[in-house]
């Protein structure tokens, strides 16, 4: 038994960020005369939260009217709670002293824990595009959550990934925490439409996890396959050679026709057709005037895709002594080669 006891009935209080925290405190006596003060933390570095005697504390309101006679309820409310408000709060009775007030009795303290939602996960992929069969890393970050316990999962097109590493910082006590995770993903040619999803579950989200996504379309590069073919004669002395550029992504592509190594024409892919898997096809043709050539012609379709080194495919066009007799089999020998 004591002359005066300061009672803080709640050992801990859990409040969501943005809400109001109620910290309860009652005294068993009003004697001796002196103010109640609230502090966060203990010892010389403690932070004054409220002083009944004096001061301006805009975020703090008293639960009851402290100017009312015989009031022994010194509970306070703190508005707009943030993770930075977490800590142990002490209700302390002071007694009038000469010249200064003297700490008389302290409550046992109430630990305020702040539940703060994690920020929306941000997923980022590699700086440079990569081709199928390569492994790329994706990172996911979310910040500002409390308490520390959190669950992070990775998915690719709804399938959970297992090859990832996750860290929650800091390791020790903090007002709020951050999570950082790196997942490894093996690219396939079908990944243009694929999504990588980072899913974060936290107590503050009430079973409705937050998701961050990255489209593999921003990461993948599917190099084209080339096929050069000779079409039937359109008119006498003319041969139509086509270059089929298939299954490439992204669309950025430049094609150059070479006749015996000399640039004949350069064009940029424009009216492409899109495949179901999100890759593109494009076709370019070259009309060759056979009569203009005395010797065989080596036609090369050279493609520069997405800033990568050019790939090419060649087609040999045989020129005979009697062009007028040339039919649709002018290039009876069609030797193709991939040159890089």
């Amino acid at each position: 038994e004591e002359e005066l006891q300061v009672i803080q009935p709640d050992k801990s209080v859990l409040v969501a960020a943005g809400e109001t925290a109620t910290l309860r405190c009652t005294a068993t006596s009003l004697i001796p005369v002196g103010p109640i003060q609230w502090f966060r933390g203990a010892g010389p570095g403690r932070e004054l939260i409220y002083n009944q005697k004096e001061g301006h504390f805009p975020r703090v309101t008293t639960v009851s009217d402290l100017t009312k006679r015989n009031n022994m309820d010194f509970s306070i409310r703190i508005g707009n709670i943030t993770p930075a408000d977490a800590g142990t709060y002490y209700c302390v009775k002071f007694r009038k002293g000469s010249p200064d007030d003297v700490e008389f009795k302290s409550g046992a303290g109430t630990e305020l824990s702040v539940r703060a939602k994690p920020s929306a996960p941000v997923v980022s992929g590699p700086a440079a595009r990569a081709t199928p069969q390569h492994t790329v890393s994706f990172t996911c970050e979310s910040h500002g959550f409390s308490p520390r316990d959190i669950t992070l999962k990775w998915f690719k097109n709804g399938n959970e990934l297992s090859d990832f590493q996750t860290n929650v910082d800091p390791v020790g006590e903090s007002v709020s925490y951050s999570i950082h995770s790196t997942a490894k993903v093996v690219l396939t040619r079908e990944d243009v439409h694929s999504q990588v999803i980072c899913e974060v579950a936290h107590v503050t989200l009430q079973g409705d996890p937050l998701r961050g996504t990255a489209n593999l379309s921003e990461t993948i590069r599917v190099p084209p396959t080339l096929e050069v073919t000779q079409q039937p004669v359109r008119a006498e002395n003319q041969v139509n050679v086509t270059c089929q550029v298939r299954k490439f992504y992204p669309q950025r592509l430049q094609l150059t026709w070479l006749e015996n190594g000399n640039v004949s024409r350069t064009e940029t892919a424009s009216t492409v057709t899109e495949n179901k898997d999100g890759t593109y096809n494009w076709m370019s043709w070259l009309l060759v005037n056979v009569s203009a050539h005395r010797d065989d012609v080596k036609l090369t379709c050279q493609v520069e895709h997405d800033g990568q080194p050019a790939v090419s495919k060649s087609h040999d066009l045989k020129v005979s002594a009697h062009p007028k007799e040339q039919g649709s089999n002018t290039a009876a020998e069609n030797t193709g080669s991939n040159e890089r």
């Epitope: 002359e3 004697i31 005369v33 002196g34 006679r69 002293g97 008389f104």
Partner: antibody, heavy 114, light 111 residues
Framework: QVQLQESGPGLVKPSQTLSLTCTVS????????VNWIRQPPGKGLEWIGI???????DYNSALKSRVTISVDTSKNQVFLKLSSVTAADTAVYYC????????WGQGTTVTVSS | DIVLTQSPASLAVSPGQRATITCRAS??????????MHWYQQKPGQPPKLLIY???NLESGVPARFSGSGSRTDFTLTINPVEANDAANYYC?????????FGGGTKVEIK
């Protein structure tokens, strides 16, 4: 139950130091303060000072230079020392519990005389 | 120092009547919404006994015939109805400011 009992010499010579003891029971001296109050014959009450549960003290400024209040919590005793006494210090001396003064001892009479 | 002036100095009351004692402080004894004024009864050869604390609160075990009121500088102790064993000296006391002080006392006699 709560009890306080003052004890000490009934007669003190002028200029000497008056020493009194208040022995308490039924409460803890670490939880409650103890006051000393005196009452000259046929007169009113005068507060001398208090020792709080943490051992800190507050004294009547009129007597401060001559008064010392101390405590021995292990013996449940509070002590009053009043130095350089004169006949004006003749009084019944009481100890009383806490700021509320809800329990008093019976008092002990101290006469200052040569 | 806060000086407490009690009036009257003495008072004779018949049993069953009302006795009113006033205590005026030289400055306010109010702090933090409360009046740190208390009332004691002292009978001859006995220590004072707490009757009322914080101006108006009846101490445990004290008959409800005793009541206190007032704030800041003006306080009243009322005994209604007075009984024969209420004959005693009555003191007001403040512990709002050091040094704590007592009033000079009011002697209540029963007619």
């Amino acid at each position: 139950q709560v009890q306080l009992q003052e004890s000490g010499p009934g007669l003190v010579k002028p200029s000497q130091t008056l020493s009194l003891t208040c022995t308490v029971s039924g409460f803890s001296l670490t939880g409650y303060g103890v006051n000393w109050i005196r009452q000259p014959p046929g007169k009113g009450l005068e507060w001398i000072g208090i020792i709080w549960g943490d051992g800190s003290t507050d004294y009547n400024s009129a007597l401060k230079s001559r008064v010392t209040i101390s405590v021995d919590t292990s013996k449940n005793q509070v002590f009053l020392k009043l130095s350089s006494v004169t006949a004006a210090d003749t009084a019944v001396y009481y100890c009383a519990r806490a700021g509320k003064m809800d329990y008093w001892g019976q008092g002990t009479t101290v006469t200052v005389s040569s | 120092d806060i000086v407490l002036t009690q009036s009257p100095a003495s008072l004779a009351v018949s049993p069953g009547q009302r006795a009113t004692i006033t205590c005026r402080a030289s400055e306010s004894v109010d702090s933090y919404g409360n009046s740190f004024m208390h009332w004691y009864q002292q009978k001859p050869g006995q220590p004072p006994k707490l009757l009322i604390y914080l101006a108006s609160n009846l101490e445990s075990g004290v008959p409800a015939r005793f009541s206190g009121s007032g704030s800041r500088t003006d306080f009243t102790l009322t005994i209604n109805p007075v009984e024969a064993n209420d004959a005693a000296n009555y003191y007001c006391q403040q512990n709002n400011e050091y040094p704590w002080t007592f009033g000079g006392g009011t002697k209540v006699e029963i007619k």
